[in-house]
């Protein structure tokens, strides 16, 4: 039967006290397959004395010994007598120190030490020879073990295949004992028949002890490459997966750690585990409560799911997301939280798992650990949150997470800031509750400071600017946010981001933010003073030329430059100028940049949104008599009249307003004809007097742009669809948000702002129109 030591080895399975169970598993009777061992090791002591930190000399003890040792006084004769005894027994003392086994039993040798706890000088000098002797003895024992095992293995193999289960059980215990010694362990793993017999026995037995011993044997073998290969070749993986269904905890623990070792180090193991149904079994085990067991199980899941879509879907179908989120909510053991966050990170790039994790409360659960002292845990949680964040815009109960994310913007870790900004950007998109929450916890100030600190690191500035863009429109605190950007000295840096070396995704986001900031009249003058208007016009001209060039070349397809359509830049810049043009001084600057011909040309755009913003800016400019005349002189009447019949209400309304303003100085009969025309086209369903709606166009857009302008355009960008976030390489999955990395090798020097008449000069100081860089794909929510 099994020895006491055997039974002790995994009795943690039966322990009611979970802490005791955990501490037991830490001992080497449970080899931890590498996941836990790092924390508890100390470097071996060269003196063989163990951990030097535990060897501090207790001075009080030393003093006590001195007092004790010399409190009695000796006579001269006594001293001479003792000296004589020492001289006579010197040879024995040396022999006793170096070869204690040669002494006669019961022979007394006087020690030169008063305290038996302290070794004598001779004993200390003998230590190396004792170590050598032990090494020789160990070598002999190793050879003996190897010989013994070599002779025993063929017979034990037969017994494992015996018909008599009693014999099989005893043989299993014996094999397990052999597997604990290194020499005999190697002998076992070199016998394919033996390993096959162990696997077969483990799979077929109904006896708990046999299952425990065979699983334990395979576990012991799994710490050697040769053993892993032997297990793999003997069909051990399906057998071990079967053992994951064992009701006996010790068997379960042996099986999972052995599988973990196989998954880590044995080629072909992953596929074999998947084929054997290991994923389903492992997910089912996530309701266990032993934290170390869960840590290894989740690590197995991570290894299996990483880079394998089918595995991710199996985990989903088995209820994995909910179980993993529960772990993140329930436990505090760092290694378990870390391994679980790694699985969630891998699953978070799967479009099917993503909503399931979010629905299970994954955002909130991951948010709980963002202030953990473990940096690796925090980073994994952030990466996962960033991947999930575009699917979580409808989630409730995000207050805590949002508050923590705003705090993390102040971190000194660039990765933490990048992720926090990306998550905030996505979570504030089209969610007015989240927008208000972020504003209330000082999000605007934190984001502005983040942009200021980030310099030209676009992986930070772009999501931060997007978040600011979202926060400055369509919620109750939007006006406060628009003011706050200015009050926290954000306008200069925002305008600066319109210039090189900014890339198109960042420029697009910045243009959108400026448009929202312009909704606040107090920002009109500062934006003008920072030179926002000429730069917006410059960008508009450049983008428009790009679209025209493509059209003239017969291209009907909208082309992406760094993931941004130039039509979006045209629309964004015109929209921003439209709002800025509410200010009389801004109108003068806009008109002075010779923009009216371009705005009129934009009325012919096939894109409704561009027609709308072009008509909108003309509508604002037409308030001034000279501008109205200039608009008419550019031949705007024809396209504007055409646009009166647009199906887009905003387009038609703005067109009407421009025509109306252009008619201010016209004769009465012209005004009358225009009024009839406007009434018939604008109020097809509900006729009313035109003069009652004279201001109709002026506030369109001010109330949160119901007309199709996407201030909250999330422009999500998924890196991972291309298999980007490769964990092992340290290239982690990016967020689902347009985060343009800085593209090296592209420097855009800027000279003074050229006269807009010299179109070619506009090309300088702008991102390249053509880019073979990685394309970013925008998708609206």
């Amino acid at each position: 039967m099994a020895t006491q030591a055997d039974l002790m080895e995994l009795d943690m399975a039966m322990e009611p006290d979970r802490k005791a169970a955990v501490s037991h598993w830490q001992q080497q009777s449970y080899l931890d397959s590498g996941i836990h061992s790092g924390a508890t090791t100390t470097a071996p002591s060269l003196s063989g004395k163990g951990n030097p930190e535990e060897e501090d000399v207790d001075t009080s003890q030393v003093l006590y010994e001195w007092e004790q040792g010399f409190s009695q006084s000796f006579t001269q004769e006594q001293v001479a007598d003792i000296d004589g005894q020492y001289a006579m027994t010197r040879a024995q003392r040396v022999r006793a120190a170096m070869f204690p086994e040669t002494l006669d039993e019961g022979m007394q040798i006087p020690s030169t030490q008063f305290d038996a706890a302290h070794p004598t000088n001779v004993q200390r000098l003998a230590e190396p020879s004792q170590m050598l002797k032990h090494a020789v003895v160990n070598l002999i024992n190793y050879q003996d073990d190897a010989e013994l095992a070599t002779r025993a293995i063929p017979e034990l193999t037969k017994l494992l295949n015996d018909e008599d289960q009693v014999v099989v059980n005893k043989a299993a215990v014996m094999v397990h004992q052999l597997s604990k010694k290194e020499a005999s362990r190697h002998a076992i793993m070199r016998s394919p028949q033996m390993v096959s017999a162990i696997v077969r026995t483990m799979q077929n037995t109904n006896d708990v002890e046999t299952a425990r011993c065979t699983a334990g044997t395979l576990h012991n073998l799994s710490h050697h490459r040769e053993g892993l290969l032997a297990i793999f070749k003997s069909g051990g993986i399906p057998a071990l997966v079967k053992m994951l269904g064992s009701p006996v905890d010790s068997v379960l623990f042996y099986a999972i750690t052995t599988l973990h070792n196989l998954l880590l180090h044995q080629e072909g193991a992953k596929m074999a585990v998947r084929l054997a149904g290991g994923l389903q079994k492992m997910v089912a085990l996530l309701n266990k409560t032993n934290v170390k067991f869960l840590a290894i199980t989740t690590d197995c899941l991570q290894i299996l799911a990483y880079g394998n879509q089918e595995s991710k879907l199996i985990i989903l179908a088995s209820g994995g997301p909910q179980a993993l989120v529960n772990i993140m909510r329930t436990y505090t053991y760092e290694k378990l939280l870390w391994t679980t966050s790694r699985v969630l990170k891998v699953l978070s790039v799967c479009s099917s798992n993503k909503p399931a994790i979010v629905e299970a409360g994954g955002m909130q659960a991951l948010g709980l650990h963002l202030t953990d002292p473990s940096q690796r845990l925090v980073q994994n949680c952030l990466w996962t949150l960033r991947n999930l964040s575009d699917a979580a815009t409808k989630q409730e109960g995000m207050e805590g997470l949002l508050g923590t994310l705003v705090q993390l913007l102040g971190s000194d870790d660039i990765n933490v800031v990048t992720c926090a900004a990306g998550i905030l950007s996505n979570l504030t998109c089209n969610n007015y509750k989240n927008k208000m929450m972020v504003c209330q916890v000082g999000g605007i100030e934190a984001l502005v400071r983040t942009v200021l600190r980030a310099g030209d690191r676009e992986d930070i500035t772009e999501p931060a600017i997007c978040a600011l863009r979202h926060l400055t429109s369509r919620h109750q605190e939007a006006e406060m946010a628009q003011n706050a950007v200015r009050l926290h000295y954000g306008l200069p840096v925002v305008v600066k981001l319109l210039h090189p070396p900014s890339h198109w995704p960042l420029i697009k986001a910045t243009v959108g933010l400026i448009r929202n900031l312009a909704l606040c009249p107090a920002n009109h003058a500062p934006l003008r003073e920072q030179g926002a208007i000429p730069r917006l016009v410059q960008l508009l001209v450049r983008a428009h030329q790009d679209t025209q060039r493509r059209t003239s070349m017969g291209g009907t397809q909208q082309q992406f430059v760094e993931g941004v359509r130039m039509e979006e830049i045209v629309e964004g810049c015109t929209g921003a100028l439209h709002i800025l043009a509410r200010d009389v001084h801004n109108r003068i600057v806009i008109r002075g940049l010779n923009t009216i011909p371009l705005f009129v040309q934009l009325l012919y755009s096939p894109i409704e949104n561009i027609q709308r913003v072009a008509a909108g800016v003309l509508c604002e400019l037409a308030q001034d008599k000279e501008a109205a005349e200039a608009i008419e002189a550019e031949g705007a009447t024809a396209p504007l009249t055409e646009l009166l019949h647009s199906r887009n209400e905003g387009v038609a309304t703005y067109a009407a307003a421009v025509l109306f303003r252009m008619s201010e100085d016209k004769p009465q009969d012209y005004k009358k004809r225009l009024s009839v025309e406007l009434t018939s086209s604008l109020f097809r369903t509900e006729p009313m007097a035109w003069n009652e709606t004279a201001d109709l166009g002026l506030d369109i857009g001010a109330q949160g742009e119901p007309l199709g302008y996407r201030q909250d355009d999330p422009s999500y960008r998924s890196f991972h669809s291309g298999g980007y976030g490769q964990d092992a390489l340290g290239m982690d999955p990016m967020m689902e948000h347009e985060m343009g990395g800085h593209h090296p090798g592209a420097d855009y020097p800027v000279d003074g702002l050229p006269d807009l008449g010299h179109a070619q000069d506009l090309m300088d100081g702008l991102p390249p129109g053509d880019s073979n860089q990685l394309a970013w794909f925008d998708t609206d929510l």
Epitope: A152, I153, L159, D164, A171, M174
Partner: nanobody, 118 residues
């Protein structure tokens, strides 16, 4: 060297009983299993029953409830009490001693004929 000497066996009518005994001599390790196997002409040797040094018994499904195995550790003997015998129990019965040493040692008795016939 271990020797196993079997006794008992013979001819018996269906439904009858027989007792087989086996005595082991020589250097016997304490960790062992003593058991009975049977083999008919041209057939595979088949497990019947066994008992460990700690009196844990194990039976083949075909004999469970009819046969009883017992042992005397002091005398190193094992007995097989066979009741409700059937014609299909007819075979040569072998005693086996398995000593769980490194390496394990298996010793066999000389065999005893049991015939169940009317």
């Amino acid at each position: 060297q271990v020797q196993l000497v079997q006794s008992g066996g013979g001819l018996v009518q269906p439904g009858g009983s027989l007792r087989l005994s086996c005595a082991a001599s020589g250097s016997i390790s304490s960790n062992n299993v003593m058991g009975w196997y049977r083999q008919g002409p041209g057939k595979q040797r088949e497990f019947v029953a066994s008992i460990t040094d700690s009196d844990l018994a194990n039976y083949a499904a075909s004999v469970k409830g009819r046969f009883t195995i017992s042992r005397d550790n002091a005398k190193n003997t094992v007995n097989l009490q066979m009741n409700s015998l059937r014609p299909e129990d007819t075979d040569v019965y072998y005693c086996r001693l398995t000593m769980m040493t490194y390496p394990p040692i298996i010793s066999w008795g000389q065999g005893t004929q049991v015939t169940v016939s009317s």
